[in-house]
């Protein structure tokens, strides 16, 4: 929840849309202090459902660059390197928050926006629809 | 990046930290207008690297609720339902932006923060270290 009191030491907001409009400091604090080796890994290549990463750019959004995963195959890669089409490579998607300039082109005014991004791929057993 | 012009119709900011402190409207706009069938799937169960989801709560964060994936097995599930420990289930992690109340407990003042979340799991071939 987002709103109201007069806490000493808190910035004041007289905006008529308060509590819906808040002040945000864009100096990003990074909680991931130690570099996580797993994150910077090559899972995208080593996965049985490998993926490529594509750069999605939008100057009216913050962050302006988002990397999107696209599965390389419809099927999954077997131990021998061949693709097994009895299994499916599918994107794992997540809803994330971004800041969208609003009004457009304004430098210091944003609105929160939910967007759906593909983060990577996983190998799943297909749903088989039996015909009576 | 975030900055500069004096567009008419844009909110003004006389904040000395400008352009580092901006106004953000928390009425979330949802870009995912059409229901994406892939998103609402049961990949977490059907994957060869299945995962469970855990509800992570932090009232000083916006959003306060984030669902985190944890891989069910160290190995990957084979077609016969058994786990193959020659392969590894690993979490696919993504850095996301959240808003952190700053100063703490302040209702209308936030700082952008990057946190690392596990979105799902994928099955990878392990890295084998050969001893000379």
């Amino acid at each position: 929840g987002i709103a109201i009191p007069r806490n000493s030491g808190c910035p004041n907001s007289e905006d008529k849309n308060f509590p819906r409009t808040v002040m945000v400091n864009l100096n990003i604090h990074n909680r991931n202090t130690s570099t996580n080796p797993k994150r910077s890994s090559d899972y995208y290549n080593r996965s049985t459902s490998p993926w490529n990463l594509h750069r999605n750019e939008d100057p009216e959004r913050y962050p302006s660059v988002i990397w999107e995963a696209k599965c390389r195959h419809l099927g999954c890669v077997k131990a021998d390197g061949n693709v097994d089409y009895h299994m499916n490579s599918v994107p794992i998607q997540q809803e994330i928050l971004v800041l969208r300039r609003e009004p457009r082109h304004c430098p210091n005014s944003f609105r929160l926006e939910k967007i759906l991004v593909s983060v990577g791929c996983t190998c799943v057993t297909p749903i088989v629809h039996h015909v009576a | 990046g975030i900055a500069i012009p004096r567009n008419s119709g844009c909110p003004n900011s006389e904040d000395k930290n400008f352009p580092r402190t901006v106004m953000v409207n928390l009425n979330i706009h949802n870009r995912n207008t059409s229901t994406n069938p892939k998103r609402s799937s049961d990949y977490y169960n059907r994957s060869t690297s299945p995962w469970n989801l855990h509800r992570n709560e932090d009232p000083e964060r916006y959003p306060s609720v984030i669902w985190e994936a944890k891989c069910r097995h160290l190995g990957c599930v084979k077609a016969d339902g058994n786990v193959d420990y020659h392969m590894n289930s690993v979490p696919i992690q993504q850095e996301i932006l959240v808003l952190r109340r700053e100063p703490r407990h302040c209702p209308n003042s936030f700082r952008l923060e990057k946190i690392l979340v596990s979105v799902g799991c994928t099955c990878v071939t392990p890295i084998v270290h050969h001893v000379a």
């Epitope: 929840g1 987002i2 709103a3 109201i4 009191p5 509590p19 928050l97 939910k114 | 979330i28 229901t35 998103r39 609402s40 049961d42 977490y44 169960n45 469970n52 989801l53 855990h54 509800r55 709560e57 009232p59 000083e60 916006y62 959003p63 306060s64 609720v65 669902w67 109340r101 407990h105 209702p107």
Partner: antibody, heavy 119, light 107 residues
């Protein structure tokens, strides 16, 4: 418009189990958490737990962990709560409530299901 | 878990009166408090979220205020259709907890 339609009143024997349902309509079922609460004259409203139909995740109030099991069926946009090993203490009105995960609040409630446990 | 103590339990008022209900949290919940109205035979309805934000379509006679541990819900001019049980709820963290409710009766 958003609607949460709960199943009808139940009269069950002690020791038995019961499965209550909550049929959602008017929104994308997979995008919102579904929570369940219990209401009794003695304890008032108590939060039981939550299921996220989109990702299958669940979380429970410790007090109800061994009592309630939450599930959801996306194809029928229905959330379920199964209550096991019923005793008279489980007699109550049970509500399902939609929760906006990002915004962080409950908005729509079902009409409630009255459960009576009696021999 | 956080205890939400709501007072009073009952209110008997006349149409046109001003009504105030309070909720006290056992620890700070920031502004993560909602107020609901539960009319007989209906589902509970959200009136106020974020302690003071009037929910869509809610008449402006209903207002909320407070932060931290002390919260107030006010009906500025009670109308006959406001006969209901009103309760507060914290969504600061699970287990989410509720006030005991205030039954509003119209003379």
């Amino acid at each position: 418009q958003v609607q949460l339609q709960q199943s009808g009143a139940e009269l069950v024997r002690p020791g038995a189990s019961v499965k209550l349902s909550c049929k959602a309509s008017g929104y994308t079922f997979s995008d919102y958490e579904m929570h369940w609460v219990k209401q009794t004259p003695v304890h008032g409203l108590e939060w039981i737990g939550v299921i996220h139909p989109g990702n299958g995740g669940t979380a429970y109030n410790q007090k109800f962990r061994d009592k309630a099991t939450l599930t959801a069926d996306k194809s029928s946009t229905t959330a379920y709560m199964e209550l096991s090993s019923l005793t008279s203490e489980d007699s109550a009105v049970y509500y399902c409530i939609r929760f906006l995960t990002y915004e962080g609040y409950f908005d729509y409630w079902g009409q409630g299901t009255t459960l009576t446990v009696s021999s | 878990s956080i205890v939400m103590t709501q007072t009073p339990k009952f209110l008997l008022v006349s149409a046109g009166d001003r009504v105030t209900i309070t909720c006290k949290a056992s620890q700070s919940v920031n502004n993560d408090v909602a107020w609901f109205q539960h009319k007989p035979g209906q589902s509970p309805k959200l009136l106020i979220n974020y302690a003071s934000n009037r929910y869509t379509g809610v008449p402006d006679r209903f207002t909320g205020s407070g932060y931290g541990t002390d919260f107030t819900f006010t009906i500025s001019t009670v109308q006959s259709e406001d006969l209901a049980i009103y309760f507060c709820q914290q969504d600061y963290g699970s287990p989410y907890t509720f006030g005991g409710g205030t039954t509003l009766e119209i003379k």
